[in-house]
């Protein structure tokens, strides 16, 4: 796993100190992957909690930085970064020692093989005349008398170490602060030197430049600044990561940086640097991480502290020990990737004297099968053999080898082949939003097979349709909008994922049924009138500029700003142009608007109307009765309401033709002492409905409704006529 934890040891001010964890994994940050975790690991080295919480800053999904240290003691201890997904989830540890500690490690990280002897050495930084206690993972391990220091150093020898011996070791003066301890990390590989795998029966590839063979998968964990399956290639100065893809920050390059990599490597300075704070350049003749490697260049080669021997023309090899007359395989990718089932062409180029020819170049697969080249291109400075590989299976993953053999000698170059399985969605795409003519879809789905996802193909077509699928290629990280669809229609939508390279297209995933919305109701109504029919009743009328093409009804919204309450009245009849709103709060100021709706979609709102409902009024007038006087007149009589809430200002009479569909009409009786009225101007032989209510501050309740018919033409009523002067006016239309 390409995971690096960097600590900048040049920064001694805790408030400026930071740790950065970088993942260079292909497809790192897929939404299905857990994020990088960077935290202080207090399980073994427990210090006081920091004065303020540490905070993480993320740079995309592949980098995370921990800052916010307030005092030097916040830095002491173990920090961990966790990255990768599933079986590749990996933890990288960094152990920070206080520069002002009593004891300081000569070397913090020790990687040893099973059965080896490990020697942990702490030199005295500030002497105390007390015993030194050694601990392993926080538990007591050993004590040394203070006089046992040898040349100012306390040493702990661990013989025949086994993997359980791995962990954090510390050396502390008795009765001294744990912050003054020397902290070490011991990594014990699960196998003896040069071996890996279950039973430790497999040979390591021979990691170069200080790379460490992983005891589980046999891969070389390369020091910072080196790459290749055997760490055979040096990166350019200032670069690190499995493919040299990362760059040390700032102008000082990798100076002052500690690099921690996945076990069993541990931590070291970058290539070309050494010392407890990685600030010292390598001495002449030394190179690599911690300057642990010696150049020993031959044949006029010069030593570069970052990359080792730089050979003069005519020589090559780690020590410039190989003459160019020996056949040499020229630059070749150290790791290649193909998709399962493909038949790739692999090229291998070689130079030498005598010149390599067709039969002299072979390709060896991991199972030992030898492939002969199918084509050879001869150029003045090289011969390139092309090998046609049969259909790849997962079993072809592993180390392949190109071999060249001439009378001048032989050379071989190993490279790693990764056979990948194209991704197949396990789930259907997800609907995020819908409208009448578009669907917004998340194409990101969980999948089987290998990433990274290079393209996502979305297929869609109407449900139950036999027409060809419409296809659209989309960015895997962005939601996609399917446009120009039909309203209120179901669509089957499915995803095909691809990974890079030939044959990277996976199969179709399951399809989801997504339905477009109704068309939007595009008309805006206008409020035409609003009448208060009582303290808690409001009649509202509205108009539309034309007949709606689409609409299920109207939504009337009443907003009571004083109470912060909204009431919504659904008129589920698109032909409606009036509504009676009841159960409102008397004495309330309402803001009212109306919208057309269709399915769940709202059209634009009318301009709002501001309506003030009067306070609740008096009880209903009593004992209303009516008597026809002529073919056009009816007399109404009633009694005052019981216990009105104040002096009655007027009565209101409502007249409506019985069984008619027209709106009612109203008359005001402005003299409250009058309790009768003659209603004139009525139609002959017509039945009418009457009711009456009083008004004090607000309108009161309606009385009982009475029914009476006007007389036929020419007939006069025999009864007495009592006429109210208030009734002289006609009807209030």
């Amino acid at each position: 796993v390409d995971l690096t934890l960097l600590a900048n040891l040049r920064i001694t001010d805790p408030q400026r100190f930071f740790l950065t964890c970088v993942s260079g994994e292909a497809g790192a940050g897929r939404s299905s992957d857990p994020p990088l975790l960077l935290e202080k690991d207090d399980r073994i080295v427990r210090t006081f909690p920091p004065g303020q919480p540490l905070y993480l800053a993320r740079n995309g999904s592949h980098q995370v930085t921990l800052r916010g240290f307030s005092k030097p003691s916040d830095l002491v201890g173990v920090f961990s970064c966790v990255g990768g997904a599933g079986a590749r989830r990996t933890r990288v540890l960094y152990v920070h020692n206080s520069p002002g500690a009593h004891l300081f490690p000569d070397k913090v990280t020790h990687t040893v093989n099973k059965g080896d002897t490990a020697v942990l050495s702490a030199h005295v930084h500030k002497e105390k005349q007390t015993d030194v206690i050694w601990k392993n993972n926080g538990s007591y391990f050993n004590t040394l008398d203070w006089q046992e220091a040898d040349d100012g150093r306390f040493q702990l020898q661990l013989q025949n170490v086994q993997p359980p011996s791995s962990g954090i070791y510390s050396a502390t003066y008795l009765e001294a602060s744990p912050l003054g301890s020397a902290f070490f990390r011991l990594i014990v590989r699960g196998c003896g030197a040069g071996r890996w795998g279950p039973g430790c029966v497999k040979d390591c590839p021979g990691c170069l430049h200080g790379g460490v063979c992983h005891d589980h998968d046999g891969e070389c964990v390369c020091p910072p600044g080196f790459t290749g399956t055997r760490c055979e290639q040096a990166c350019r100065e200032g670069r690190f990561g499995q493919s040299c893809q990362e760059q040390c920050p700032g102008t000082a390059g990798c100076r002052g940086l500690t690099f921690c990599l996945p076990d069993p490597y541990g931590c070291s300075c970058g290539s070309g640097w050494r010392g407890s704070q990685c600030q010292e350049a390598c001495a002449p003749g030394h190179f690599g991480a911690d300057c642990r490697l010696q150049c020993q260049c031959q044949n006029g080669g010069t030593c570069d502290r970052f990359s080792g021997c730089v050979c003069p023309s005519g020589w090559h090899g780690v020590h410039c020990e190989k003459s160019d007359r020996i056949p040499q395989i020229l630059s070749m990718a150290t790791e290649v990737e193909f998709n399962i089932g493909t038949m790739p062409r692999i090229n291998c180029a070689a130079a030498g004297n005598p010149f390599p020819v067709r039969g002299s170049m072979k390709l060896r697969k991991p199972d030992g099968t030898m492939l002969l080249s199918t084509k050879v291109i001869v150029e003045p400075d090289r011969t390139t053999a092309e090998f046609e590989v049969p259909s790849l299976t997962l079993g072809d993953s592993g180390f392949w080898e190109c071999r060249v053999s001439t009378s001048g000698g032989q050379d071989s170059r190993r490279f790693k082949v990764n056979v990948k399985v194209p991704p197949v969605p396990l789930t259907a795409p997800r609907l995020l939003a819908k409208q009448s003519r578009q669907l917004v879809v998340s194409p990101l789905v969980s999948f089987s097979g290998d990433g990274p996802i290079s393209s996502v193909r979305l297929h869609y077509r109407p449900q139950d349709s036999t027409i060809a699928w419409s296809a659209i290629v989309v960015d895997p990280s962005e939601n996609v909008t399917l446009m120009n669809l039909k309203p209120k229609t179901g669509y089957n939508v499915r995803v095909q994922l691809s990974r890079p390279g030939e044959g990277g297209e996976g199969g179709w995933g399951p399809s989801a049924l997504m339905t477009t919305d109704c068309p939007e109701p595009l008309l805006q109504p206008w409020l035409e009138s609003w009448h208060v029919e009582g303290p808690d009743r409001l009649r509202v009328s509205w108009s539309l500029p034309s007949v709606p093409l689409s609409g299920d009804g109207f939504l009337l919204r009443l907003w009571d700003g004083a109470r912060g309450q909204e009431r919504r009245e659904n008129i589920s009849f698109p032909q409606a142009r009036t509504a009676l709103l009841t159960g409102l709060t008397p004495g309330t100021h309402y803001q009212l608007d109306v919208r057309l709706y269709h399915c769940t979609l709202l059209g634009p709102a009318s301009p709002p109307a501001h309506v003030h409902l009067p306070p609740s009024g008096p009880p209903a007038p009593r004992h209303l009765h009516a008597q026809a006087l002529s073919d056009s007149e009816i007399q109404l009589m009633w009694q005052h309401p019981e216990a009105p809430s104040g002096p009655i200002s007027k009565y209101i009479v409502e007249i409506q033709v019985a069984g008619g569909s027209g709106d009612p009409q109203w008359m005001d009786v402005d003299r409250p002492e009058e309790t009768s009225i003659i209603v004139r101007g009525l139609n002959a032989s017509t039945r009418y409905l009457f009711r009456v209510r009083a008004s004090v501050q607000g309108l009161g309740d309606w009385s009982n409704t009475v029914e009476e018919a006007t007389l036929g033409n020419g007939l006069q009523s025999e009864g007495p006529v009592r006429e109210s002067r208030a009734a002289e006016e006609g009807l209030d239309q």
Epitope: E520, E528, P604, A609
Partner: antibody, heavy 120, light 107 residues
């Protein structure tokens, strides 16, 4: 051809009043809502007020509520804006525009504008 | 009230460039949005109505998209005559607020 012609602008002191008019022609005035939009010198557009085709339904921006009154006379094909209690920040070109009847939400027809300057 | 926020407030581009102006509503407004162009001393001109419909007579290099809260006006190939200030306006609920405008000039 649809035409909208504003008038009634001018120089007025803070606290003063004006009545802006917008004469409409070339369409059935009583079928359309009408709006006022203003633009202070060097600034953006600000929606001011709306009135329904019948005149029964009106709406205002918060900044003018209680000071401005929109009205219309369908028999004269004229839209009005009564502006009272004027402030310096009311200085602007006032445009009248025809509101959409539905479906096409946007103001296609605009008048040329009338300038109101509030200054002491 | 619904707030309309345009970005950028001004931009400079070369003739032939693809130019994008965005408008964001403080709450969902469906498709009820218009775009206008206003040249100095002139009356605003309607370019796009109901979010994406091109007004008759407007060049096809202008297009509108979006719904809900995020809207975009795109000029596919900028011409010298496109120098102007552009405004968006919502029609979902009153008051029918405008964006603050985007001033477009040629480099």
């Amino acid at each position: 051809e649809v035409q909208l012609l504003e008038s009634g602008g001018g120089l007025v002191q803070p606290g003063g009043s004006l009545r802006l008019s917008c004469a409409a022609s070339g369409f059935t005035f009583s079928m359309y809502g009408m709006v006022w939009v203003r633009q202070a010198p060097g600034k953006g557009l600000e929606w001011v007020s709306v009135i329904s085709p019948s005149g029964g339904n009106t709406g205002y921006a918060d900044s003018v509520k209680g000071r401005f009154t929109i009205s219309r006379d369908n028999s004269k094909n004229t839209l009005y804006l009564q502006v009272n209690s004027l402030r310096a920040e009311d200085t602007a070109v006032y445009y009248c525009a025809r509101a959409p009847r539905g479906y096409s939400y946007g103001y296609y027809y605009w008048g040329q504008g009338t300038l109101v300057t509030v200054s002491s | 009230d619904i707030q309309m926020t345009q970005s950028p407030s001004s931009l400079s581009a070369s003739v032939g460039d693809r130019v994008t102006i965005t408008c964001r509503a403080s709450q969902g407004i469906g498709h009820y949005l218009a775009w206008y162009q206003q040249k100095p001393g002139k009356v605003p001109k309607l370019l796009i109505y109901t979010a994406s419909t091109l007004q008759s007579g407007v060049p096809s290099r202008f297009s509108g998209s979006g719904s809900g809260t995020d809207f975009t006006l795109t000029i596919s190939s900028l011409q010298p005559e496109d120098v102007a200030t552009y405004y968006c306006q919502q029609f979902n609920s009153y008051p029918h607020t405008f964006g603050q405008g985007t001033r477009l000039e040629i480099k």
